[in-house]
């Protein structure tokens, strides 16, 4: 008789999830010499241990602590780029500006990027059919808790000037409910972080508005200022030119506003 299985509202675990995590770990440790000591099998065991046999609506940050310990990585704290709702451009930027890091440029972020996973209470099975949706089912699900945990740690590690890339095409350029707005902003350490510099990325070719004056940016400024961190904001009117100028900063057209 087939066992009853909980039906969740979100997509199930990404197919070949164990193989993908292990392969990504091996690839990352090969590319990053400072992480060559990492035992990828142990990393997978710790990852699996965080959610297997546990109710997928009852996951805690403590569940991920063994994985956090194995994935400990020192990133230059003054080279951190946060992002919200504009992941692709942020990743394109750090691929060019190699000394800067998004969360997904770290081992743990790289392992889990774009993946979904969950298990089932009291069985060692991975659920490939469905996983809890953050809104419709529960917030303490394996994926959400993972990103909350690594995002908090990433923000806590930051120092000096921290940059955040924000999507100027969205109705809420700064969204208090995003990972950046709900986790990272509140875990920047005022004694370490001097300034948060927001880069607002414009979508339209002819968009010359100063999006740094947007009400949601003013809200971000207020939150940051109350935490005694300085705030700065820049419009990136031409993201294509912005990336080009990161690649070729000596280009004569790169002195003008981008």
């Amino acid at each position: 008789v087939p066992r009853w299985r909980q039906q969740w509202s979100g997509p199930g675990t990404t197919k070949r999830f164990p193989e993908t995590v292990l392969a990504r770990c091996v690839k990352y440790t090969e590319i990053h010499p400072e992480m060559r000591h990492v035992d990828c099998q142990s990393v997978w065991d710790a990852f699996k241990g965080a959610f297997i046999s546990k109710h997928p609506c009852n996951i805690t940050e403590e569940d991920y602590q063994p994985l956090m310990k194995l994935g400990t990585q020192t990133v230059p704290c003054n080279k951190i780029l946060l992002w919200s709702r504009i992941k692709d451009l942020a990743h394109q930027f750090t691929q060019v500006q190699r000394d800067m890091f998004t969360l997904e440029d770290t081992l743990l972020g790289y392992l889990a990027d774009d993946l979904t996973w969950c298990g089932e209470f009291n069985t060692s099975k991975i659920n490939y059919q469905s996983c809890p949706d953050w809104r419709k089912d529960c917030s303490n699900n394996p994926v959400s808790v993972f990103w909350k945990t690594v995002s908090r740690r990433f923000a806590e590690a930051a120092c000096d000037v921290v940059h955040v890339m924000l999507n100027g095409s969205r109705s809420k350029i700064f969204d208090k409910n995003s990972t950046f707005g709900s986790v990272e902003v509140h875990n920047l350490q005022p004694e370490k972080v001097q300034t948060l510099e927001a880069w607002v990325i414009h979508g339209g070719r002819e968009d010359s508005r100063d999006l740094c004056q947007d009400p949601t940016i003013k809200e971000l400024e207020s939150i940051i200022s109350k935490r005694n961190i300085q705030f700065s904001c820049k419009n990136i009117y031409r993201p294509d030119k912005f990336l080009q100028c990161v690649k070729n900063p000596e280009d004569s057209s790169c002195t003008s506003e981008i």
Epitope: C77, Q194, S225, Q230
Partner: antibody, heavy 116, light 111 residues
């Protein structure tokens, strides 16, 4: 290039007040907080605190609370240190130094002498 | 407050030799692998000059003869080889936890 230029030496009598200025150039003033550091004659360095140049919020170290006030005039990219009710033991060189918590940029220092 | 203790208080070194100054913090100054300990050189009548930030990063324009190492509570500034114009006071400073604090200084003299 980044520069912090402080006001000149001051000779004051006990009980008087003094205001030391620190004018910044070569960067966006409101992007980096300004620290104040004291060095008494022949002594080491003491961090007095800092001022958030974006909000104007001062953070004063416990040993300097009361008579020491940090202020700003962002229109001229200048930070100020005011000391009231001066005492002989306030005699020192006062430095401004730009954040972050490691100080790559310092003013040249302002000697404040308190003597009757 | 985090107390920083430098040793030795003074040091006399011949040109071409190695000078080593240590700084011990009363508690860890590390945060996620980054150490918030910095080193300065100060010559008479001048403001301090940043040499090393975050334990081991050489400030731009500072000769590679200067190097820093250490983590958590124990840190070292090394000058190798020492030159005649390295005569100065050297200070460590932490920015892990307010109030920022400095070591009491080490006076380096060239024989």
């Amino acid at each position: 290039q980044i520069q912090l230029v402080q006001s000149g030496s001051e000779l004051k009598k006990p009980g008087a007040s003094v205001k030391v200025s620190c004018k910044a150039s070569g960067y966006t003033f409101t992007n980096y907080g300004m620290n104040w550091v004291r060095q008494a004659p022949g002594q080491g360095l003491e961090w007095m605190g800092w001022i958030n140049t974006y909000t104007g919020e001062p953070t004063v170290a416990d040993d300097f609370k009361g008579r020491f006030v940090f202020s700003l005039d962002t229109s001229v990219s200048t930070a100020y240190l005011q000391i009231s009710s001066l005492k002989a033991e306030d005699t020192a060189v006062y430095y401004c130094a730009r954040n972050p918590g490691w100080f790559a940029y310092w003013g040249q220092g302002t000697l404040v002498t308190v003597s009757s | 407050d985090i107390v920083l203790t430098q040793s030795p208080a003074s040091l006399a070194v011949s040109p071409g030799q190695r000078a080593t100054i240590t700084c011990r913090a009363s508690e860890s100054v590390d945060n996620y692998g980054n150490s918030f300990m910095h080193w300065y050189q100060q010559k008479p009548g001048q403001p301090p000059k940043l040499l090393i930030y975050r334990a081991s990063n050489l400030e731009s324009g500072v000769p590679a003869r200067f190097s820093g190492s250490g983590s958590r509570t124990d840190f070292t500034l090394t000058i190798n080889p020492v030159e005649a114009n390295d005569t100065a006071n050297y200070y460590c400073q932490q920015s892990h936890e307010a109030p920022w604090t400095f070591g009491q200084g080490t006076k380096v003299e060239i024989k």
